[in-house]
C-alpha cells in the first residue's frame, strides 16, 4: 500500500534571468526511493537522478539545469518561456510511483515577488 | 555528425595492465552525455563497464570496481580506459559509446583485445 | 543484479515474416529499456528507448512494447538488412545489463 506523501514547493514565482530551486520531499513512508525524474510542462524530461547511476541532465538543458539540492533541481537564467508546470516523479521500492507538481511563474525583473520559500537570491 | 573511434594495444600480457583510447570527433566530450566503455565477450554477451560524466563524474560496473579507471583528457576530446590485472577472460572486443539517460545512442566501431602470455 | 532473460536465443525467419522478441526482466524497471541491433562485424545499433520510443532513424517496421518486467520487440515484414543479433538492455541501475541476444536468421 502506498502511504508516502510528496510535499512540493507548491506555486513559486522567480525573477526573469535569475535562478530558483524546485524540491519535493517523499514523507511517511519507509519505501527507498531508486530514482527521481524531473519533467517540464510540456512532460520533457529535464533530468534523471538514480539511486545508483547518479544525475543525468538532459544535454538540451545541461547549461541551465543543476543537479540539486538533494534530489532537487535548480533552474538557472529563467526565461518567461520557464512559465509553467514541472513534476517530479518519484520511483520507490516496494511503494512504486509518486508524483508532485510544482507550478512556476518567470516574472519580468521589475515585478517579480520573492514568493518562493525556495528560491536563490 | 559525432564518431567515436576506440585504439590500443590488440594484445595484452595476464597480469598488465589494459589500456584503450576513445577519440571523438563531432562533438565536445564536455559538453553533455555521459561516455561509456562496454564489452563484447567471444560468446556473444555484451558487459558494461562504466562511464565518465561531461563534468567528470565517474560511475562503474561494480563487478570491475577494484581494477578499472576511466578518465578524460578534454583538451584532446578524448576519454580513456584502463584496466588492472588483466586475465584471459578479459579478452573481447571494447567499444566505446555516448550515452543518453543511460542507453547508448552512438558507438564506436570496437577493437579487439586478445589476453595471452 | 538486474537479470535480462531474451527468448529465443535463437531464430529462422524469412523475408516478409513478422518476427517478435521478448525480454524478461528480474525486477520491475518501469519503461527503462533499449533495444539494440548487431550486424556481424559491426558495433550495436540503438532501436528503441524507453520501451517502446524508436531512435532516429528507425525504419517504422521496429515497435517496441511492454513495462515492468515484460518487453517485446516486434519487425513486421522482416528485410535482408534485418538479420543479425538482438539485444535488450535495461538503464534503471548500477550494472547496466543487457540480454544474453537473439540470434535471427535467414530461413
Known amino acids: 500500500m502506498m502511504t508516502g506523501t510528496i510535499e512540493t514547493t507548491g506555486n513559486i514565482s522567480a525573477k526573469k534571468g535569475g535562478s530558483v530551486i524546485l524540491q519535493c520531499h517523499l514523507s511517511s513512508t519507509m519505501a527507498q526511493v531508486t530514482q527521481v525524474n524531473w519533467e517540464q510542462h510540456d512532460h520533457s524530461l529535464l533530468a534523471i537522478r538514480n539511486a545508483e547511476l547518479g544525475w543525468h541532465i538532459y544535454p538540451a538543458f545541461k547549461d541551465r539545469v543543476a543537479p540539486g539540492p538533494g534530489l532537487g533541481l535548480t533552474l538557472q537564467s529563467l526565461t518567461m518561456n520557464d512559465t509553467g508546470e514541472y513534476f517530479c516523479t518519484y520511483h520507490t521500492y516496494p511503494d512504486g510511483t509518486y508524483r508532485g507538481r510544482i507550478f512556476l511563474e518567470v516574472l519580468e525583473s521589475s515585478v517579480a515577488e520573492h514568493s518562493a520559500r525556495f528560491q536563490i537570491p | 555528425d559525432v564518431q567515436l573511434q576506440e585504439s590500443g594495444p590488440g594484445l595484452v600480457k595476464p597480469s598488465q595492465s589494459l589500456s584503450l583510447t576513445c577519440t571523438v570527433t563531432?562533438?565536445?566530450?564536455?559538453?553533455?552525455y555521459d561516455w561509456h566503455w562496454i564489452r563484447l565477450f567471444p560468446g556473444h554477451i555484451l558487459e558494461w563497464m562504466?562511464?565518465?560524466?561531461?563534468?567528470?563524474?565517474?560511475i562503474y560496473n561494480p563487478s570491475l570496481k577494484s581494477r578499472i579507471s576511466i578518465t578524460h583528457d578534454t583538451s584532446k576530446n578524448h576519454f580513456f580506459l584502463k584496466l588492472n590485472s588483466v586475465t584471459t577472460e578479459d579478452t573481447a572486443t571494447y567499444y566505446c559509446?555516448?550515452?543518453?539517460?543511460?542507453?547508448?545512442?552512438?558507438w564506436g566501431a570496437g577493437t579487439t583485445v586478445t589476453v595471452s602470455s | 543484479d538486474i537479470q535480462m532473460t531474451q527468448s529465443p536465443a535463437s531464430l529462422s525467419a524469412s523475408v516478409g515474416e513478422t518476427v517478435t522478441i521478448t525480454c524478461r526482466v528480474s525486477?520491475?524497471?518501469?519503461?527503462?529499456l533499449a533495444w539494440y541491433q548487431q550486424k556481424q562485424g559491426k558495433s550495436p545499433q540503438l532501436l528503441v528507448y524507453?520501451?517502446?520510443t524508436l531512435a532516429e532513424g528507425v525504419p517504422s517496421r521496429f515497435s517496441g512494447s511492454g513495462s515492468g518486467t515484460q518487453f517485446s520487440l516486434k519487425i513486421n515484414s522482416l528485410q535482408p538488412e534485418d538479420f543479425g543479433t538482438y539485444y535488450c538492455q535495461h538503464n534503471y541501475g548500477n550494472p547496466l545489463t543487457f540480454g544474453a541476444g537473439t540470434k535471427v536468421e535467414l530461413k
Open positions: 562504466g562511464y565518465i560524466s561531461y563534468s567528470g563524474n565517474t
Open positions: 563531432g562533438y565536445s566530450i564536455t559538453s553533455a
Open positions: 559509446a555516448r550515452g543518453s539517460f543511460w542507453y547508448f545512442d552512438v
Open positions: 524507453n520501451a517502446k
Open positions: 525486477e520491475h524497471i518501469y519503461n527503462y
